[in-house]
């Protein structure tokens, strides 16, 4: 078991055409974060590097915005954006921490935000 924990926005839902913020927070460790990767399934969406700043993958540049903080904003959502998203914290000396968020993009206006939960 690692020393830190990642808190995420958990299971969330949003309306088609709208936007959503994906957020993770690493706590309970003194390790230094050198980079956070945001991934959807096996696709890299974005990187926030402590030295180099943000890099958004070219194929997502039009619909992904950096922040707030180490989070990621997804815009112009489509039903195809439904699925798992991962924040991957690269730290030293702890190694890698991974948080999971499940996003459901809904056709109607019944989208609700889920509760926050922790992944050790």
């Amino acid at each position: 078991m690692m020393t830190g924990t990642i808190e995420t926005t958990g299971n969330i839902s949003a309306e088609k055409g709208g936007s959503i913020i994906l957020q993770c927070h690493l706590s309970s460790t003194t390790a230094q974060v050198t980079q956070v990767n945001w991934e959807q399934q096996d696709q890299l969406l974005a990187i926030c590097n402590a030295d180099l700043g943000w890099h958004i993958s070219p194929s997502f540049k039009d619909r992904v915005a950096p922040g707030p903080g180490l989070g990621l904003t997804l815009q112009s959502l489509t039903v195809n954006d439904t699925g798992e998203y991962f924040c991957i914290y690269h730290t030293y000396p702890d190694g890698t921490y991974t948080g999971r968020i499940f996003l459901e993009v809904l056709e109607s206006s019944v989208a609700e935000h889920g509760a926050r939960f922790q992944i050790p």
Epitope: I47, L52, Y92, P93, G95, T96
Partner: antibody
Framework: QLQLQESGPGLVKPAETLSLTCTVS??????????WTWIRQPPGKCLEWIGT???????FHNPSLKSRVTIPVDTSKNQFSLKLSSVTAADTAVYYC??????????????WGQGTLVTVSS | DIQMTQSPSSLSASVGDRVTITCRAS??????LNWYQQKPGKAPKLLIY???SLQSGVPSRFSGSGSGTDFTLTISSLQPEDFATYYC?????????FGCGTKVEIK
């Protein structure tokens, strides 16, 4: 198979700067999942962690070496370096470069260079 | 800094013997303890990581145990190629620190 190779002068004069380079082959230094490290071992003595660097330049170093250490990275050459300033005879040691991995919690040093002896003497 | 203390500093053993080396940390390091083998003129080689996980390619006669502050490296049946110096290392926090080694010699 990943390989690390240290290179640099074997003799350095007191008060000068020790400069070593570690060339990584068989893998990319820009891997997001690994950090890169310098460790030294004075003759007949214990291993000492000098410092660790990430591909982007984030550096962690041993406070015992104060501000004498810098660890530059050159991703275009797949290399990282060690610069240790104001050396004394106490810095005479075999210097190793190593990779921090594998992808586990609080990872160990899983690949090492063969080491290079640096003697500080006038 | 976390101090790592190994014992004994040296030991003599015969081929086929069961050998046990201990490592103690000055504070709890959970299971973030690694073991290395070093032969003269060579770089250290990773044997065990995370206290008890065997590194790929390392013979199963090597095993590790412990958590918190007390750890053990065991060689179940010493082989001729096992005569070397063994080091423990904590990867719990920086500065990373090593024990000063246990030299295993031929009796």
């Amino acid at each position: 198979q990943l390989q690390l190779q240290e290179s640099g002068p074997g003799l350095v004069k007191p008060a000068e700067t020790l400069s070593l380079t570690c060339t990584v082959s068989g893998g990319s230094i820009s891997s997001y999942d690994h950090y890169w490290t310098w460790i030294r071992q004075p003759p007949g003595k214990c291993l000492e962690w000098i410092g660790t660097v990430y591909y982007s330049g984030s550096t962690f170093h041993n406070p015992s070496l104060k501000s004498r250490v810098t660890i530059p990275v050159d991703t275009s050459k797949n290399q990282f370096s060690l610069k240790l300033s104001s050396v004394t005879a106490a810095d005479t040691a075999v210097y190793y470069c190593a990779r921090v991995g594998p992808d586990v919690s609080h990872p160990p040093f899983d690949y090492w260079g063969q080491g290079t002896l640096v003697t500080v003497s006038s | 800094d976390i101090q790592m203390t190994q014992s004994p500093s040296s030991l003599s053993a015969s081929v086929g013997d069961r050998v046990t080396i201990t490592c103690r940390a000055s504070q709890s390091i959970s299971s973030y303890l690694n073991w290395y083998q070093q032969k003269p003129g060579k770089a250290p080689k990773l044997l065990i990581y995370a206290a008890s996980s065997l590194q790929s390619g390392v013979p199963s006669r090597f095993s590790g145990s412990g958590s918190g502050t007390d750890f053990t490296l065991t060689i179940s049946s010493l082989q001729p190629e096992d005569f070397a110096t063994y080091y423990c290392q904590q990867s719990y926090s920086t500065p990373i620190t090593f024990g000063c080694g246990t030299k295993v010699e031929i009796k």
